[in-house]
Interface confidence: low
């Protein structure tokens, strides 16, 4: 069957297309090409007689068409009007006719797009920005890129106008980025230059650093204030409510206790019209800068479990300090049997249990220094059961009875394996 193949099917303006004929019959008299889906003398492009090898232009001939002996038709310098159907009419030697129709589409070569914006300096959480990809082009697809990646999914992003317009509602500082648009059609794709969105925001609540509250007399006080802001914030400092200076950093050398007070950093963004403040308390203290190592004194270091109590005392010559206790790296008190008294100087455990055995230490600290004691070991023993009351059956220890021990067993639910352990330990 006679068929026509267009190569390419989608043709760019200014390029060329070949209407390629397949299954051309043998013994031909000639053939003729027509614009459209049927044979119409008024729309004949060109005719060709094989015997004379003569090509004759028709009414629809534009001078851009070339016919080949195999009946294929080349059209050069394609224009938009060339889009559509083309019909080949074949006249065989027996004067029986055959027809076939092919088609192609013409698309413009796209120009480089550009982005227009309705707001070049949007304010965070307040403004919307609409980017429009120019120019408007028929049969083009529009795509958007943010920082060279496809658009993220967000309820604040909306595409409209056939994806030609990208709107960002309630812009945030995270929308500050590079935006590009791309136009595509079947024959070309072009990408715009970047537009950098500069979202104005802040200032956020300022942070005063360093975070220290306590200083020694004679130290230099150097405070820095920072608030995320675009454009950068203007800063000012107040001490105890009195304006000091308009700088981001405050420096006071050789401070004394008189420099104690409230330090306020004020951050202002003149473009967004917003301002924020943070207040920091500075205490210049005469506290000893180095806390001496404390010592632990124990009422006893070996005690009997479920019977004895013990008092541990953290001794220090420093004043104005606080004390905290640790046991096996855990902060105390950790049970109702443990009590702290005398401003945490004394740790009392009453009664002492098996699980209280281990290492204890105390730590003394003031706001600018701390030190800890050497550890002390508390041993917890249990009275061993008499040898004659224990018998060994399959590696288990049991009471044999006598001496009222069964009554004790019933009352105290002694754990045999523990009894066995202590028995072997002490005998």
């Amino acid at each position: 069957k006679l068929t026509i193949e267009s190569t390419p099917f989608n043709v760019a303006e200014g390029k060329e297309v070949l209407l390629l004929v397949h299954n051309l019959p043998q013994h031909l008299f000639g053939y003729s090409w027509y614009k459209g889906e049927r044979v119409d003398g008024n729309r004949q492009i060109i005719g060709y007689v094989i015997g004379t090898q003569q090509a004759t232009p028709g009414p629809a001939y534009s001078g851009r068409e070339i016919i080949y002996p195999n009946a294929s038709l080349l059209i050069q310098n394609i224009i938009q009007n060339d889009t559509g159907f083309y019909t080949l009419h074949v006249i065989k030697s027996d004067l029986v006719n055959e027809e076939a129709t092919g088609q192609f589409r013409v698309y413009p070569e796209l120009p480089k797009p550009s982005i227009s914006s309705n707001n070049s300096k949007p304010v965070e959480d307040k403004d919307a920005v609409a980017f429009t990809c120019e120019p408007e082009t028929q049969d083009a697809t529009y795509l958007w890129w943010v920082n060279n990646q496809s658009l993220p999914v967000s309820p604040r992003l909306q595409l409209s106008n056939g994806n030609r317009t990208l709107t960002l509602f309630n812009v945030t500082r995270n929308d500050s980025a590079s935006y590009k648009c791309e136009t595509q059609n079947p024959v070309s794709a072009r990408r715009s230059d970047s537009v950098i969105l500069n979202v104005l925001y802040g200032p956020d609540t300022p942070t005063i650093s360093p975070s220290d509250t306590y200083y020694r007399p004679g130290a230099n006080l150097s405070l820095s204030c920072y608030a995320a802001s675009n454009p950068p914030a203007q800063y000012s400092w107040l001490i105890n409510g009195t304006f000091q200076q308009s700088t981001q950093e405050l420096f006071i050398p050789n401070i004394t206790v008189n420099n104690s007070g409230s330090y306020t950093c004020h951050a202002n963004n003149s473009v967004t019209g917003c301002n924020r403040t943070t207040v920091k308390t500075i205490i210049v203290t005469e506290l000893s800068p180095v806390v001496a190592k404390p010592q632990i004194k124990a009422s006893k270091t070996t005690v009997t479990g479920d019977k004895d109590s013990v008092n541990l005392t953290c001794s220090t010559n420093d004043t104005g300090i606080s004390i905290r206790w640790f046991f096996k790296n855990q902060s105390l008190p950790s049970s109702e049997r443990m009590k702290l008294s005398q401003g945490n100087i004394t740790l009392s455990i009453n009664p002492v249990k098996r699980e209280d055995a281990g290492t204890y230490w105390c730590e003394v600290f003031n706001p600018i220094s701390k030190n800890q004691s050497d550890p002390i070991m508390l041993n917890v023993n249990y009275n061993a059961l008499p040898q004659e009351n224990l018998i060994n059956v399959d590696e288990q220890l049991y009471f044999q009875g006598g001496s009222g021990l069964n009554d004790i067993f019933e009352a105290q639910k002694i754990e045999w394996h523990e009894a066995r352990a202590h028995h072997h330990h002490h005998h």
């Epitope: 500050s176 590079s178 970047s194 950098i196 500069n198 995320a228 454009p231 950068p232």
Partner: nanobody, 119 residues
């Protein structure tokens, strides 16, 4: 297309000076901020200085305060880094970068220019 082209690097003796330039195209430096970032072998990347030309705001790393000065000429769409009293530890590849936010640096970098401080 956004492009940043650095120049002005070279070999200089300790205590010497260099002036780096960053020529921007494809966007207007008035609409953003420009920073100089340096990368030295075995060291962390360091933001040396940045400037927001439309507001005149500048920031400097502690390591270069008092020695380096950042500036911008919006008519030439170019940023500069004047480096004085150079030290051996200033040896690095210096890159110009677009700062679209105060605290974030986008992936628009130049090709870099090498500064070597050595006697």
């Amino acid at each position: 297309e956004v492009q940043l082209v650095e120049s002005g690097g070279g070999l200089v003796q300790p205590g010497g000076s260099l002036r780096l330039s960053c020529a921007a195209s494809g966007f207007n430096i008035k609409d953003t901020c420009i920073g100089w970032v340096r990368r030295a072998p075995g060291k962390e990347e360091e933001l040396v200085a940045d400037i927001c030309p439309s507001y005149g705001g500048t920031r400097y790393a502690d390591s270069v305060k008092g020695r380096f000065t950042i500036s911008a000429d919006t008519s030439k769409n170019t940023a500069y880094l004047q480096m004085n009293s150079l030290r051996a530890e200033d040896t690095a590849v210096y890159y110009c970068a677009i700062v679209s936010k105060i605290d974030q640096y986008y992936n628009y970098w130049g090709q870099g220019t090498t500064v070597t401080v050595s006697s």
